[in-house]
């Protein structure tokens, strides 16, 4: 067991008397705070620069009679290289300069061994070795250089960033690891507070737009910052951040820009910059047209990029109309901080002028598109109708019409090229073509290069000038035995006009055909006449194929009619009805033939 | 070299004494402590007790008081043990060994005595 | 007295095994020393104060443990191992011996 010289002994421990003791630099120290005495501690200094090795303590077992019979072991914490022990006497030296910061305690343990038996003549026991510090190490910052941001315009004494500089020092004994921080350079813009590091601003109204970057220098000194205390320092890089107090302002009062008049909307006619001394969202402008006789004439977007105002043709211009245009144009700051409201408006506004200028603009048509009607019975040279359009610029120059060839490949139609007329130049045909598209350009006589074009839709009217027709070939059977008025076959016209009120057929026997027919045909008024028997029985040897001429007539003017045959065989049929043969000709009845029988 | 030499085996009838010897060569004799320990057949071992050739100081295991005694020979570096009222509880192979801390620690045995107690 | 427990009794191992062997006592000892002992042949020192290694001893031996328990290790097991290890303490007299552990190889 380890024990200090008895008159340092506390109470507490064990009854039995120990046998090792160990005396030397060990310290009853009471008076250091947060630190309970040890009896089994040595203390060393650190840093120790004498020639001699230094003496640590001695250790001491009550069997030693002093004879050499015990042996001193020493082990642990640099036994045998930092820590060396007299093997007879007990004696403990240090043999190297010892650093605290790289170590600050040692737990070493002894033994006393009886050389003669081999044998322990204690326990092993415990002790500490403490280095004691000495100021031997500055205070170094956890930053070699601090990075830091404060907003300009900021109240004295805000806080712009915490610096903390450590010591190795023993922070529980004297003042060796006590820092206190204080500024080298900076002032007097900054402060520093001494015990915390914390960096403020000491200036009223530090102005980023008059200077963005501040370098400061701290020093942090220990021995709470009496003489002789060591120090280390910082650079501090401080960038004032901007805030909004500045308005925008417009380097000029007026701006005048020129536009064609043929400028579509959306066309960009000149761009207008208000500067801010702030900057990012600070700086960002927003332009708007107050005022002014363009207001509904040109519109003013912001340029996310350059913050300018780019001022925009919103409707079509007319210089015939109004040649020049007057704006009122405030730039304004969106994001406004309310404690400098103080400082004015955060707007500016400027006049901007614009002037219409004109351009030679092709002839106008007084419609967009022109619908002609005309007879299909039109002679050569009938005019049609006409087309109007006009110079729009002031200089009203004449102008010549002509039709596009393209449209009008048969040359059908012509015009007039002064007034515009449009005649016919070949006889038409509605059933042959009811529309015809044609499109007249109009060229201004002066300049060629200037034309316009619009499309003519020509409608071609009905004349009666078509004869209805069966609307198929008709090829009917009668049976031998079929009786008097029997429906054999139902006809059909069709006529290519297009009356207005619509087809309105009669049909009849051709009158050659009237007077001793075997067959009559019966008008059934809805545009349809049916083919009937008009004798009971039919001899197919007597006659085997009879022709009907059928006259179809419309009811328009002038009216038209045509002859049509029917043929009719005699078939030899059975009891249903059903043709059996005809003279050895095979029948073919044709799609929706009626046998009538 | 260091050597401790013992004496022969011993055959020895019940109720008789025997003494074996131990002497020591390589070192000095006096500076280390004889110890003796017994080893039955088959068994462990057991520390008899210790002599400080110095000044024949003894110590006994209480055991074997009554039963060892030990005693030194400086002239002749010897060491003796002497075993009495033998049974055949005391058949066993007897050491002497010596511990030490000179440089670092030792300890040297002898080669071991065989006493044998029969009828 | 102080008993020393030693086990196991009789334990076997394979070359490069590590391996384990303790000995407990009846009651606190400052330290323990162990000694190797081969057939026919006196014991000899092996460690000393618990975890020193006497000379001449493998490093693959170590030596650790602290009031009533204690226990050697080799490692990685080699055959000249291969012998019965007793425990001792010199603490408290009568200085008394383990029962032995046995080593065999595999």
């Known amino acids: 067991t380890l024990s200090t010289p008895l008159s340092k002994r506390t109470s507490g421990f064990p009854a039995k008397k120990r046998a090792l003791e160990l005396s030397g630099n060990s310290k009853n120290e009471l008076s250091r705070s947060k630190r309970s005495w040890m009896w089994n501690q040595f203390f060393l200094l650190e840093e120790y620069t004498g020639s001699d090795y230094q003496y640590v303590g001695k250790l001491h077992s009550d069997q030693d009679r002093g004879d050499g019979s015990l042996k001193y072991i020493l082990s642990g914490d640099g036994a045998g290289d930092l820590f060396i022990i007299n093997e007879n006497t007990g004696d403990i030296q240090a043999t190297k300069r010892l650093d605290r910061e790289e170590k600050p305690v040692y737990i070493l343990r002894a033994q006393a061994i009886n050389r003669r038996t081999g044998r322990p003549v204690e326990p092993e026991s415990e002790f500490i070795i403490k280095i004691h510090d000495i100021n031997d190490n500055e205070p170094i910052f956890t930053k070699e250089v601090y990075t830091a941001t404060v907003p300009e315009m900021s109240d004295v004494g805000t806080f712009v960033v915490q610096v903390t500089a450590t010591d190795a020092d023993d922070p529980t004994y004297g003042n060796s690891a006590k820092v206190v921080y204080s500024i080298l350079q900076g002032q007097p813009y900054f402060s520093v507070e001494s015990e915390t590091g914390i960096i403020k601003t000491a200036l009223l109204n530090m102005d980023r737009e008059n200077r963005e970057q501040y370098q400061v220098v701290i020093q942090a000194k220990d021995m709470g910052g009496q003489m002789g205390g060591l120090s280390g320092t910082t650079t501090v890089n401080i960038t004032l951040t901007d805030v909004n107090d500045n308005p925008p302002r417009f380097p000029q009062s007026t701006y005048q820009f020129k536009t064609p008049e043929s400028s579509p909307p959306g066309t960009p006619i000149g761009r207008i910059k208000a500067s801010d001394a702030d900057v990012g969202e600070n700086a960002e402008i927003e332009y708007s047209i107050t005022d002014g006789e363009g207001l509904d004439m040109f519109d003013v977007i912001t340029d996310q990029e350059t913050q300018e105002g780019i001022i925009t043709v919103k409707k079509l211009l007319d210089f015939e109309k109004k040649k020049v245009y007057t704006l009122k144009v405030e730039a304004s700051n969106p994001h406004v901080e309310p404690r400098f409201l103080y400082l004015g408006p955060f707007k500016d506004s400027a006049t901007v002028r614009i002037v219409v200028e004109d351009v030679d603009e092709p002839p106008v048509f007084s419609k967009l598109a022109y619908i002609l009607q005309i007879r299909e019975d039109a002679q050569i040279n009938t005019t049609i109708g006409s087309v109007t359009a006009q110079d729009p610029d002031a200089a009203r120059n004449p102008v010549k019409y002509s039709v596009d060839r393209h449209t009008d490949m048969d040359r059908i139609f012509n015009i007039d090229s002064g007034n515009g007329s449009i005649f016919t130049s070949k006889l038409l045909d509605r059933e042959t073509l009811l529309w015809h598209n044609i499109t007249v350009i109009a060229t201004e006589i002066n300049n060629p290069k200037q034309s316009s074009r619009v499309p003519l839709y020509i409608k071609v009217l009905d004349v009666n000038d078509n004869a209805p027709e069966f609307a198929e070939f008709y090829e009917t059977f009668v049976c031998e035995k079929a009786k008097a008025d029997q429906l054999i076959q139902t006809l059909r016209a069709v006529d290519k006009d297009d009356p207005y009120s619509g087809h309105q057929f009669s049909f009849s026997l051709a009158p050659e055909a009237a007077s001793g027919s075997n067959f009559t045909i019966q008008d059934n008024k809805d545009n349809t006449a049916g083919i009937l028997t008009r004798k009971n029985g039919y001899n197919r040897h007597e006659m085997s194929t009879y022709l009907l001429p059928v006259v179809i007539s419309d009811n328009d003017y002038p009216v038209q009619s045509s002859t049509g045959t029917v043929t009719v065989r005699v078939c030899a049929c059975d009891h249903h009805g059903n043709m059996q043969s005809c003279h050895a000709e095979a029948l073919i009845h044709p799609t929706g033939l009626s046998t009538g029988a | 070299e260091v050597q401790l030499q013992q004496s022969g085996p011993e055959l020895v009838k019940p109720g008789a004494s025997v003494r074996i010897s131990c002497k020591a060569s390589g070192y000095t004799f006096t500076d280390y402590y004889m110890n003796w320990v017994k080893q039955s057949h088959g068994k462990s071992l057991e520390w008899i007790g210790d002599?400080?050739?110095?000044?024949?100081?003894?110590t006994y295991n209480q055991k074997f008081k009554g039963k060892a005694t030990l005693t030194v020979d400086k002239s002749s570096s010897t060491a003796y043990m002497e075993l009495r009222s033998l049974t055949s509880e005391d058949s066993a192979v007897y050491s002497c060994a010596s511990f030490g801390y000179d440089v670092e620690w030792f300890g040297y045995w002898g080669q071991g005595t065989l006493v044998t107690v029969s009828a | 007295q102080i008993v020393l427990t030693q086990s196991p009794a009789l334990m076997s191992a394979s070359p490069g095994e590590k391996v384990t062997m303790t000995c407990s006592a009846s009651s606190s000892v400052s330290y323990m020393y162990w000694y190797q002992q081969k057939p026919r042949s006196s014991p000899k020192p092996w460690i000393y104060?618990?975890?020193n290694l006497a000379s001449g001893v493998p490093a693959r031996f170590s030596g650790s443990g602290s009031g009533t328990s204690y226990s050697l290790t080799i490692s990685s097991m080699e055959a000249e191992d291969a012998a019965t290890y007793y425990c001792q303490q010199w603490s408290s007299n009568p200085f008394t011996f383990g029962s032995g552990t046995k080593l065999e190889i595999k």
């Open positions: 104060l618990t975890s």
């Open positions: 002599i400080d050739p110095n000044n024949a100081n003894t």
